[in-house]
C-alpha cells in the first residue's frame, strides 16, 4: 500500500468548516477524518468546495463505507451526489422519501441523469411499489417520469397513485404504457360523476377499449380532437358515425382537418359513405352505398 502523506502540524480538522476550502487536495486527504466527515456531512453542502476537493471527500467516504453509504450520510450528500456513479448508488438502501427529495433537489432543472434514474430505481424497488407520495415527488421533479417506465414497471403502480398524475405527466407515454395505466385510472376514478370522471380520465384514454368509448359517447362528454387523435386506432374503428358524433359533440367538425391522419383516416375507410355524409363535413373515402361489409375477424372466430 502506498504510504499516505502525514497531516502537517496544526492542520488536523476538528470539524468540517470553511477553513477546509483552503486546504490542498493532499491536505484534505491527510487531515480530514472520514468518520468526522460522515457525521458532519450536512455541512459540506454549505461550504463552496471545488469539484477536485469533493472528489477527495467522496474518496474518504468510499473508504469508510465500501459496502455503500448509510442513509444518514446519503441524506446530506448535497452536491456530492453529482459525483456518485450509478455503481455507487446501486450499493445504497434508500428508504426515506425525504432522502430522495433531498437528492432530487440537487439535480433539479437538469435532465434525468443515469445517477438519478438508478436512485429512483433503487428507491422504488425498495418500497415494492410506486406509491402515491413517491409518484407525487417524482412527477414534480420529472413530469415525464411515468412515461419513462416500462409497461411491466407501470404494473406496480397502485390505482390510488393515479390521483397524483397530471395530464402533462402522460404527454410522452406510448399506447403500450397507456394500456397499463388506463384500467388503473378507470378504477381510481370509478366513483366520480360523469363530467368530473371525464375530466380525470381524459388523459388516460389512449389506453381505452372500444366498449368504454361507446359508453362515453352516451354521456355528452364533448371530447376534443387532440384527445380523439390519441385514441387507439383499433378502439376507434368499430365506433359508428353516430357514436363518434356523440363522443365529439361540437368538436366533430374537426374531423375534416384530420381526415388524412390516423385514427380518423382508418375510421373513415370503415364507415358507409352515406353515414359519413350525414355529418355534413364532406368526409370522403367511406364504403360506397350498396357494398357489403364482411367482418373477417368474426368469420375467423367462427371457423
Amino acid at each position: 500500500e502506498v504510504e499516505k502523506t502525514a497531516c502537517p502540524s496544526g492542520k488536523k480538522a476538528r470539524e468540517i468548516d470553511e477553513s477546509l476550502i483552503f486546504y490542498k487536495k493532499w491536505e484534505l486527504e491527510a487531515c480530514v477524518d472520514a468518520a468526522l466527515l460522515a457525521t458532519q456531512m450536512d455541512r459540506v453542502n454549505a461550504i463552496p468546495f471545488t469539484y477536485e476537493q469533493l472528489d477527495v471527500l467522496k474518496h474518504k467516504l468510499d473508504e469508510l463505507y465500501p459496502q455503500g453509504y448509510p442513509e444518514s450520510v446519503i441524506q446530506h450528500l448535497g452536491y456530492l451526489f453529482l459525483k456518485m456513479s450509478p455503481e455507487d448508488i446501486r450499493k445504497w438502501n434508500v428508504t426515506s422519501l425525504e432522502t430522495l427529495k433531498a437528492l432530487l433537489e440537487v439535480n433539479k432543472g437538469h435532465e434525468m441523469s443515469p445517477q438519478v434514474a438508478t436512485l429512483i430505481d433503487r428507491f422504488v424497488k425498495g418500497r415494492g411499489q410506486l406509491d402515491k407520495d413517491t409518484l407525487d415527488t417524482l412527477t414534480a421533479f420529472y413530469p415525464g417520469y411515468l412515461c419513462s417506465l416500462s409497461p411491466e414497471e407501470l404494473s406496480s403502480v397502485p390505482p390510488s397513485s393515479i390521483w397524483a398524475v397530471r395530464p402533462q405527466d402522460l404527454d410522452t407515454c406510448d399506447p403500450r404504457q397507456l394500456d397499463v395505466l388506463y384500467p388503473k385510472a378507470r378504477l381510481a376514478f370509478q366513483n366520480m360523476n360523469g363530467s368530473e370522471y371525464f375530466v380525470k380520465i381524459q388523459s388516460f384514454l389512449g389506453g381505452a377499449p372500444t366498449e368504454d368509448l361507446k359508453a362515453l359517447s352516451q354521456q355528452n362528454v364533448s371530447m376534443d380532437l387532440a384527445t380523439f387523435m390519441k385514441l387507439r386506432t383499433d378502439a376507434v374503428l368499430p365506433l359508428t358515425v353516430a357514436e363518434v358524433q356523440k363522443l365529439l359533440g361540437p368538436h366533430v367538425e374537426g374531423l375534416k382537418a384530420e381526415e388524412r391522419h390516423r385514427p380518423v383516416r382508418d375510421w373513415i375507410l370503415r364507415q358507409r359513405q352515406d353515414d359519413l355524409d350525414t355529418l355534413g363535413l364532406g368526409l370522403q373515402g367511406g364504403i360506397p352505398n350498396g357494398y357489403l361489409v364482411l367482418d373477417l375477424s368474426m368469420q375467423e372466430a367462427l371457423s
Epitope: E18, F22, I47, P48
Partner: antibody, heavy 116, light 110 residues
C-alpha cells in the same frame, strides 16, 4: 479561548491614511481566512475585505477597492488593513473577524473618524 | 441600499415567536450559505446561525435558521427581554466576489 484585538484607529483628515492591526490568539491563525467589517455610526454592518490563509487572493468591497489593502503575517498571528485616501464616509467602527463566509469570532472594534 | 433585504423592525411580547426574513438573489443566498448575527446595544456582533441552520455552541435553541431558494429566515421562539437587539443576515455573493449583509432588523420586546 479565541481572541481578536484591533488597534490603530483614530482621527484622521480626509485624504489621509491609517493602518489597522488585528492580533489573533486562541486558534491556528494560519489555517483560517480573515475579514474586516465596518459599521458607520447608527448604521448597519458593511463587509470591507477578506483574505485567505495563504494571502493568495484578496477580496474587497467596491466602496474601498483601490484605496484599502488587506494583508496578514501568519508568523505574528496578525491581520492588517492599510487605508489610504480616506473619506468622511469611511468613518466607522472597524471589526476584524475570523473566517470569510461566516464570521464566528469578532474583535471589539476600533473607531476610525475621518474629519477635517 | 443593502444587497440582502430585511424588514427594518420586528417586535413581540415575551414568550412569543418572532420571524425575520432575508431576501437575496441566486448569486448570494441562492448559491451560498446564510449566517445570522446578533448585535446587542453597544457591543460587537455575535454569530447566531451559520451554514443556514447551524447554531454555534452557547447559542440557545430558541434561535433557528432556515433557507429556501433565494430567501432565508431567522426565528426566535420564546422571546425574552435579552433578545432585544439588531439582527443581520449575511452571505457570500458569487457575482460581487464579496460578502453581503442585510440592512439589519431591530427586534423590540414589548
Amino acid at each position: 479561548e479565541v481572541q481578536l484585538l484591533e488597534s490603530g484607529g483614530g482621527l484622521v483628515q480626509p485624504g489621509g491614511s491609517l493602518r489597522l492591526s488585528c492580533a489573533a490568539s486562541g486558534f491556528t491563525f494560519s489555517n483560517y481566512a480573515m475579514s474586516w467589517v465596518r459599521q458607520a455610526p447608527g448604521k448597519g454592518l458593511e463587509w470591507v475585505s477578506g483574505i485567505p490563509p495563504d494571502s493568495g487572493s484578496k477580496y474587497y468591497a467596491d466602496s474601498v477597492r483601490g484605496r484599502f489593502t488587506v494583508s496578514r503575517d501568519n508568523s505574528k498571528n496578525t491581520l492588517y488593513l492599510q487605508m489610504n485616501s480616506l473619506r468622511a464616509e469611511d468613518t466607522a467602527v472597524y471589526y476584524c473577524a475570523k473566517n470569510m463566509l461566516s464570521f464566528d469570532y469578532w474583535g471589539q472594534g476600533t473607531l476610525v473618524t475621518v474629519s477635517s | 441600499q443593502s444587497v440582502l433585504t430585511q424588514p427594518p423592525s420586528a417586535s413581540g411580547t415575551p414568550g412569543q415567536r418572532v420571524t425575520i426574513s432575508c431576501t437575496g438573489s441566486s448569486s448570494n443566498i441562492g448559491s451560498n450559505a446564510v449566517s445570522w448575527y446578533q448585535q446587542l446595544p453597544g457591543t460587537a456582533p455575535k454569530l447566531l446561525i451559520y451554514y443556514n441552520s447551524k447554531r454555534p455552541s452557547g447559542v440557545p435553541d430558541r434561535f433557528s435558521g432556515s433557507k429556501s431558494g433565494t430567501s432565508a429566515s431567522l426565528a426566535i421562539s420564546g422571546l425574552r427581554s435579552e433578545d432585544e437587539a439588531d439582527y443581520y443576515c449575511g452571505s457570500w455573493d458569487s457575482s460581487l466576489n464579496g460578502y453581503v449583509f442585510g440592512g439589519g432588523t431591530k427586534v423590540t420586546v414589548l
